[in-house]
């Protein structure tokens, strides 16, 4: 017997649908109506035929009461080819829901997104996460999607993007965005970061994650942040192959004084990089290739320093830095 495509847990909290049949019974998803967190995986299906069955131009207000009754706070949609018109139709209807977090993964968005009608209500998301989503519209996709969202977005995550650079002149500011995660875009690089960090469009960023993004030096990242006017409190550069030395011809970069936490773990560093901020609350240098204990003059003034998992650290040796957070146990790096 074929397993049920949708499973709702016994607490009405989590509902997961895996539609793998060529002609799935979408009505099965109705059992998710009382779930708080919903995941729908469409098995790579092309949802184009849906456009014939739904009126994408219908006034979504007619569904308002039905949608308001949904408990869903977090929705994940994955593995499908979705016409932009259908995506927009869904966003318009979900604007009447309690949805706060939306994740789109492994999607191919086809066609262009129509402009937001004057009477339409934007979706009041606090978090939007995109992973491996391709858009037919290329660089303008963020601006097109943004118009369907209210301006209160706090968390934006874009991974495995086909076009991580945005059409900055079309993008409006994200006034409430405090966390931007561009991790897992290995082709981004420092020049790409400059293109992605549209100047003055991210005025409230506190946390910036750039894991596995092809960054080369902390100084290069500093320059990109300075150019964009982005002043994060916390910066994650882990899982990049970082060079410790700075190009002598490159101008010195002054880090923002707002930065107090820097993650340089898993960065292949054989020595402490030059050009780090002068003062930090947290510096993570764990799981690098440091062959000797860093000298005080190589390090910023730092409250919490993590050096676990470096070759020079033999379990049980004295901690190399006052106030460090080393456990004395080499983690699995």
């Amino acid at each position: 017997t074929t397993p049920e495509p949708c499973e709702l847990d016994d607490e009405d909290f989590r509902c997961v649908c895996n539609f793998s049949e060529p002609q799935p019974d979408w009505s099965e998803a109705f059992q998710c109506v009382s779930a708080v967190e919903v995941e729908i995986h469409a098995g790579g299906l092309n949802l184009e035929p849906f456009l014939k069955r739904v009126d994408a131009d219908a006034d979504p207000r007619q569904y308002a009461d039905t949608v308001k009754a949904l408990r869903v706070r977090r929705l994940t949609v994955g593995a499908a080819q979705v016409p932009a018109q259908l995506l927009v139709g869904a966003l318009r209807v979900l604007a009447y829901s309690r949805l706060k977090e939306l994740t789109l993964e492994d999607l191919k968005i086809t066609g262009t997104m129509p402009p937001l009608p004057l009477e339409a209500t934007g979706l009041a998301l606090s978090s939007l996460r995109l992973r491996n989503v391709s858009w037919a519209t290329g660089r303008s996709w963020l601006a097109e999607l943004q118009q369907w969202l209210k301006p209160g977005l706090k968390v934006l995550s874009i991974a495995q993007a086909h076009s991580p650079a945005f059409s900055c002149e079309q993008v409006r500011a994200f006034p409430a965005l405090t966390s931007l995660d561009l991790s897992d875009n290995p082709g981004l690089g420092e020049r790409g970061l400059m293109a992605a960090l549209c100047p003055h469009k991210f005025p409230a960023i506190q946390n910036l994650a750039l894991r596995n993004t092809g960054m080369e030096t902390p100084t290069g990242v500093c320059a990109a942040l300075a150019a964009a006017g982005v002043q994060p409190h916390s910066l994650d550069l882990s899982h990049n192959s970082l060079r410790a030395t700075v190009n002598p011809s490159a101008p010195r970069c002054m880090w923002s004084s707002a930065l107090n936490s820097l993650n340089l773990s898993f960065a292949g560093l054989e020595q402490v990089p030059k050009g780090l901020p002068a003062k930090l609350r947290v510096l993570d240098l764990s799981c690098n290739r440091l062959n000797r204990a860093p000298q005080p003059d190589e390090l910023p003034e730092v409250d919490n320093l993590t050096l676990d998992g470096n070759p020079f650290l033999v379990p049980g040796t004295a901690l190399p830095h006052e106030g460090s957070m080393n456990s004395g146990v080499v983690p699995a790096c």
Epitope: D9, E11, F13, E37, R71, R74, R98
Partner: antibody
Framework: QLQLQESGPGLVKPSETLSLTCTVS?????????WNWIRQPPGKGLEWIGY???????SYNPSLKSRVTISRDTSKNQFSLKLSSVTAADTAVYYC????????WGQGTLVTVSS | DIQLTQSPSSLSASVGDRVTITCRAS??????????LHWYQQKPGKAPKLLIY???NLQSGVPSRFSGSGSRTDFTLTISSLQPEDVATYYC?????????FGQGTKLEIK
């Protein structure tokens, strides 16, 4: 059998940050459900503080949102509560609880805010 | 926020009596076919214990003298034959919409 156990200091000074940890055994905090903090001031009713879900998503009571952070350590199967800028009004028994119909409770820990 | 108002705030009844506690919500706590209203019993110095979930479902291990009913905004907890061990404070709680809220409690005593 699922068990939850709260731990943390029983006395916190005004204006400081209250920090509690809940250790879960008999179930994984990253596989399902919501993992909540609920408090009860002495002789008063129950107040939901917030949750962190199996996915890492959080939801907070708006009345406390500006002061609350709930986080988790999946490697230790623990979730934690931080409540900043505490006053005497935050004196309460703090419970960690599983689900949104609250079927599994820790035994509770009394936190007193006093100088 | 959804406000839950319990009545009475306290009550005294004799062993064997049928006891009813009501809970009224400021707006509907129904989502489609389910009412997300639950009932708890709390004894002094102990954590609350789930009695009834989704308005009418008896939690495993709870005596069958406890029952629940209601939908949308009006709900009832009934103890068909009061026992001495039922002395406690009873709370209703909604999980239809965050913030998840509790009633103010009903203190039940034996005459």
């Amino acid at each position: 059998q699922l068990q939850l156990q709260e731990s943390g200091p029983g006395l916190v000074k005004p204006s400081e940050t209250l920090s509690l940890t809940c250790t879960v055994s008999g179930g994984s905090i990253s596989s399902d459900s919501a993992w909540n903090w609920i408090r009860q001031p002495p002789g008063k009713g129950l107040e939901w503080i917030g949750y962190i879900s199996y996915s890492g998503s959080t939801s907070y009571n708006p009345s406390l949102k500006s002061r609350v952070t709930i986080s988790r350590d999946t490697s230790k199967n623990q979730f934690s509560l931080k409540l900043s800028s505490v006053t005497a009004a935050d004196t309460a028994v703090y419970y960690c609880v599983r689900g949104l119909r609250f079927a599994y409770w820790g035994q509770g820990t009394l936190v007193t805010v006093s100088s | 926020d959804i406000q839950l108002t319990q009545s009475p705030s306290s009550l005294s009844a004799s062993v064997g009596d049928r006891v009813t506690i009501t809970c009224r919500a400021s707006e509907s706590v129904d989502s489609y076919v389910n009412a997300f209203l639950h009932w708890y019993q709390q004894k002094p110095g102990k954590a609350p214990k789930l009695l009834i979930y989704r308005a009418s479902n008896l939690q495993s291990g709870v005596p069958s003298r406890f029952s629940g009913s209601g939908s949308r905004t009006d709900f009832t907890l009934t103890i068909s034959s009061l026992q001495p061990e039922d002395v406690a404070t009873y709370y209703c709680q909604q999980s239809n919409e965050d913030p998840y809220t509790f009633g103010q409690g009903t203190k039940l005593e034996i005459k």
